[in-house]
């Protein structure tokens, strides 16, 4: 991959250990926790990132617990099981043999059960709604300029194909970014919207996973765009299966 040999690091993932032990002495990086080789020219899967986050010693963690608003971790942090491609396994269990089914972004989509719980397939999250509230500014941002800036961000920083950014809505101070990506639309090599959303979430919280420049510099016509609250909603291709008791 693209980590240079003179200083063996992974530009797209801080949570790695790298060494020049690849073919021809090329730099090879492995995710903390799983030890899986990662491609440093693109985003690392969310599953491997969460696993790395859980494996890091508490005093060495570069990432903090998400705020109460981050629906992605409603059940708290957990050490996920990832498949050989780095995706979430459909069934996740904790150390006390409590199990549940997750979607492709690792969010629980069923009631919790025991080891007998079956999760037949990994259900794809095909629609992600990122709801942001920006800090007060002198005036509202121009909608088309804001739209262009956020689309540019997802294209450049996360390498997400522009067609997957379905819409950017704005009613001051609320910004909504809609990401859509059906199974049939996602080609080999395409960044997954779930991974892009997770990197964005970490960036917005000032916990960038990238090396180098690190933090975001979001600006609309030179005016800083500072986010003070983030909510992320996930919609799956197949609706979740929760009992009525939970819904009440």
């Amino acid at each position: 991959h693209t980590a240079a040999q003179d200083n063996c690091t992974c530009p797209t993932n801080k949570m790695t250990v790298c060494s020049p032990d690849g073919p021809g002495g090329r730099c090879q990086c492995r995710a903390l926790g799983s030890g899986m080789a990662v491609d440093c020219s693109t985003l690392t899967s969310k599953c491997l990132l969460l696993k790395a986050r859980m494996s890091a010693p508490k005093n060495a963690r570069t990432l903090v617990r998400p705020s109460e608003h981050a629906l992605v971790d409603n059940d708290g942090l957990y050490d996920p099981d990832c498949d050989p491609e780095g995706r979430f396994k459909a069934r996740q269990c904790n150390q006390t043999s409590v199990c549940w089914c997750v979607n492709s972004v690792g969010v629980r989509r069923t009631d919790k059960g025991d080891l007998s719980l079956r999760c037949d397939e990994l259900v794809r999250t095909h629609h992600i709604l990122i709801d942001l509230r920006h800090r007060p500014t002198a005036g509202a941002f121009n909608h088309s300029d804001l739209d262009a800036e956020l689309r540019r961000l997802f294209r450049e920083r996360y390498r997400l194909h522009p067609k997957f950014v379905a819409a950017v809505h704005y009613e001051q101070p609320t910004i909504q970014i809609e990401l859509r990506q059906n199974t049939s639309q996602k080609a080999a090599g395409d960044v997954d919207i779930g991974d892009a959303a997770y990197y964005f979430e970490r960036d917005i919280k000032g916990e960038s996973l990238f090396q180098g420049r690190g933090g975001l510099d979001l600006r609309v016509r030179g005016e800083p765009l500072q986010v003070e609250r983030t909510l992320i909603y996930y919609l799956d291709e197949i609706p979740p299966k929760f009992s009525m008791k939970r819904l009440t």
Epitope: A3, P11, Q211, G212, D217
Partner: antibody
Framework: AVTLDESGGGLQTPGGGLSLVCKAS????????MFWVRQAPGKGLAWVGV????????NYAPAVKGRATISRDNGQSTVRLQLNNLRAEDTGTYYC???????????????????WGHGTEVIVSS | ALALTQPSSVSANPGETVEITCSGG???YGWFQQKSPGSAPVTVI????YRLSDIPSRFSGSASGSTATLTITGVRVEDEAVYFC??????????FGAGTTLTVL
């Protein structure tokens, strides 16, 4: 059309300082990173440094680190390279260049340059 | 790496396809054409495979892993120049190759 016009070159004395200015037009200057690249006589291109669009971030090549300062004035659409403690090896043509990928995690890469100035020649000699 | 690795020279007959490779970088690659020493470089390819609108379609770029390739399909006499590749190392310092001289026979 994008135009980048460098000025400030000429004969400089060793140990002294120089200030090169690049005036940009033809694009929204406030939205793009800017680079300085130099080329010694008969040699290849050498990356000097980069400044992000807001001016809050700069990065420099080891050969000029500690001696170079890149700054920008978004109101005037100008970017400046200040280089102190000049050496003979600083001799060459200095190019201002426009970046295209300000959010990229590899935004400092020379691979993100999409436009160049005509260059200004600097000679460091006593 | 202090510089990216690219061949010092390549040659081809008019109409042939030329490939120039570049390796050792981290991040995006670009390709820059310089027709004579001291003349301003011209960006042929940026961000691995993006071509500027005024660059002929016979120029294309690709990147796989840490290697990039500039391809000129149906090379012309006017394509004679020195071609520099550009990228960065993993410490985010920009890098260029030493240049490849393209001779059209």
């Amino acid at each position: 059309a994008v135009t980048l016009d460098e000025s400030g070159g000429g004969l400089q004395t060793p140990g002294g300082g120089l200030s090169l200015v690049c005036k940009a037009s033809g694009f929204d200057f406030i939205d793009y990173d800017m680079f300085w690249v130099r080329q010694a006589p008969g040699k290849g291109l050498a990356w000097v440094g980069v400044i992000n669009r807001s001016g809050s971030y700069t990065n420099y090549a080891p050969a000029v680190k500690g001696r170079a300062t890149i700054s920008r004035d978004n109101g005037q659409s100008t970017v400046r390279l200040q280089l102190n403690n000049l050496r003979a090896e600083d001799t060459g043509t200095y190019y201002c260049a426009k970046g295209v990928c300000t959010h990229c995690w590899d935004a400092d890469s020379a691979g993100n340059i999409d436009a160049w100035g005509h260059g200004t020649e600097v000679i460091v000699s006593s | 790496a202090l510089a990216l690795t690219q061949p010092s020279s390549v040659s081809a007959n008019p109409g042939e396809t030329v490939e120039i490779t570049c390796s050792g970088g981290s991040g995006n690659y670009g390709w820059f054409q310089q027709k004579s020493p001291g003349s301003a470089p011209v960006t042929v390819i940026y961000n691995n495979n993006y071509r500027l609108s005024d660059i002929p379609s016979r120029f294309s770029g690709s990147a796989s892993g840490s290697t990039a390739t500039l391809t000129i399909t149906g090379v012309r006499v006017e394509d004679e120049a020195v071609y520099f590749c550009g990228s960065a190392d993993s410490t985010y310092v920009g890098l260029f190759g030493a240049g490849t001289t393209l001779t059209v026979l």
